[in-house]
Interface confidence: medium
């Protein structure tokens, strides 16, 4: 049992965590949850996780999606469970790309 006496009371959310940064964990705790999609070497890389610091999340979440990366953010316990980030393809397909989940 971890016993703390912090002053700051960050309002934290439980988030689904999927990807290399999660290690063996399937969840994380942060001030925002996210679901992201990026293209690396022709692969669609899906990741989910959390931003520990609100400012960090605020910057990333406000970044508009590009053809190579998209991030969707939310606030609420497990809110990123059913969110899958979408690239702004507008009907265009990217030949030679495959879906790839980093587990």
């Amino acid at each position: 049992m971890e016993d703390e006496k912090p002053k700051v009371n960050p309002k934290l959310y439980m988030c689904v965590c999927e990807g290399l940064s999660c290690g063996n964990e399937d969840h994380c705790e942060g001030q925002q949850c996210f679901s992201s999609l990026s293209i690396n070497d022709g692969f669609h890389v899906y990741q989910k996780g959390c931003f520990q610091v609100y400012e960090q999340g605020k910057m990333t979440c406000k970044t508009p999606p590009s053809p190579g990366q998209a991030v969707e953010c939310c606030q609420g316990d497990w809110c990123n469970r059913n969110i899958t980030a979408q690239l702004p393809t507008k009907g265009k397909s990217f030949p030679g790309t495959q879906n790839f989940h980093l587990e």
Epitope: M1, E2, D3, V8, N9, K11, L12, M14
Partner: antibody
């Protein structure tokens, strides 16, 4: 319907111990942080302690730290407050409160149980 | 610890008339996420408290719209536009921006 029912309050001598319980129903208990708030007779409210939904993180007021221990049994939907080295000033109604989320404390205390009375007197 | 100071201690009001309660914190209540975690609770005699307002001005589910909250920084106000008989009891402000969570001393609202 979300329900919280406290029990375990009693008359105890100074220096004694008591274990309060709070039985929760009507929601997924392990998804929510919980807190204990007390109210001395005729006085205002005082937050005592809180615990995250998974029981990993615990938080205490200055008056509770070192004497009280908050814990939970998620398999039984029950919250506990172990109170040691009790003093006269610990006399109060102790309320169990559901928090807003798993790791969220304060801001959204709802609902409250009916409370259990702890009296510390010789 | 953040100290919450409420005024007045007691507020005798006439049914149908407005009432206002002030709450001042010893330091600013803006959290790292930019929100201000200031709540208001109501406690009728012999009952547990119930949540009225959270994050300064958000009415909790089922709370009548005659209750409203406002303020910023260190000064906050709860207003009841038209007091009804069921509104009697104690009102508490509470901050949850920092641990330990702290309450104001309470304001007693009674009918004249």
């Amino acid at each position: 319907e979300v329900q919280l029912v406290e029990s375990g309050g009693n008359l105890v001598q100074p220096g004694g111990s008591l274990r309060l319980s709070c039985a929760a129903s009507g929601f997924t208990f392990s998804n929510y942080a919980m807190s204990w708030v007390r109210q001395a007779p005729g006085k205002g409210l005082e937050w005592v302690s809180g615990i995250t939904g998974n029981g990993i993180k615990t938080y205490y007021s200055v008056s509770a730290k070192g004497r009280f221990t908050i814990s939970r049994d998620n398999s039984k939907n029950t919250l506990f407050l172990q109170m040691n080295s009790l003093r006269a000033e610990d006399t109060a109604i102790y309320y169990c409160v559901k928090e807003r989320g798993h790791s969220w404390f304060g801001d959204w205390f709802d609902p409250w149980g009916q409370g259990t009375l702890v009296t510390v007197s010789s | 610890d953040i100290v919450m100071t409420q005024t007045p201690l007691s507020s005798p009001v006439t049914l149908g008339q407005p009432a206002s309660i002030s709450c001042r914190s010893s330091q600013g209540l803006v959290n790292s996420d930019g929100n201000t975690y200031l709540s208001w609770l109501h406690q009728r005699p012999g009952q547990p408290p119930r949540l009225l307002i959270y994050e300064i001005s958000n009415r909790f589910s089922g709370v009548p719209d005659r209750f409203s909250g406002s303020g910023a920084g260190t000064d906050f106000t709860l207003k009841i536009s038209r007091v009804e008989a069921e509104d009697v009891g104690f009102y508490y402000c509470m901050q949850s921006t920092q641990f330990p969570l702290t309450f104001g001393g309470g304001t007693k609202v009674e009918i004249k």
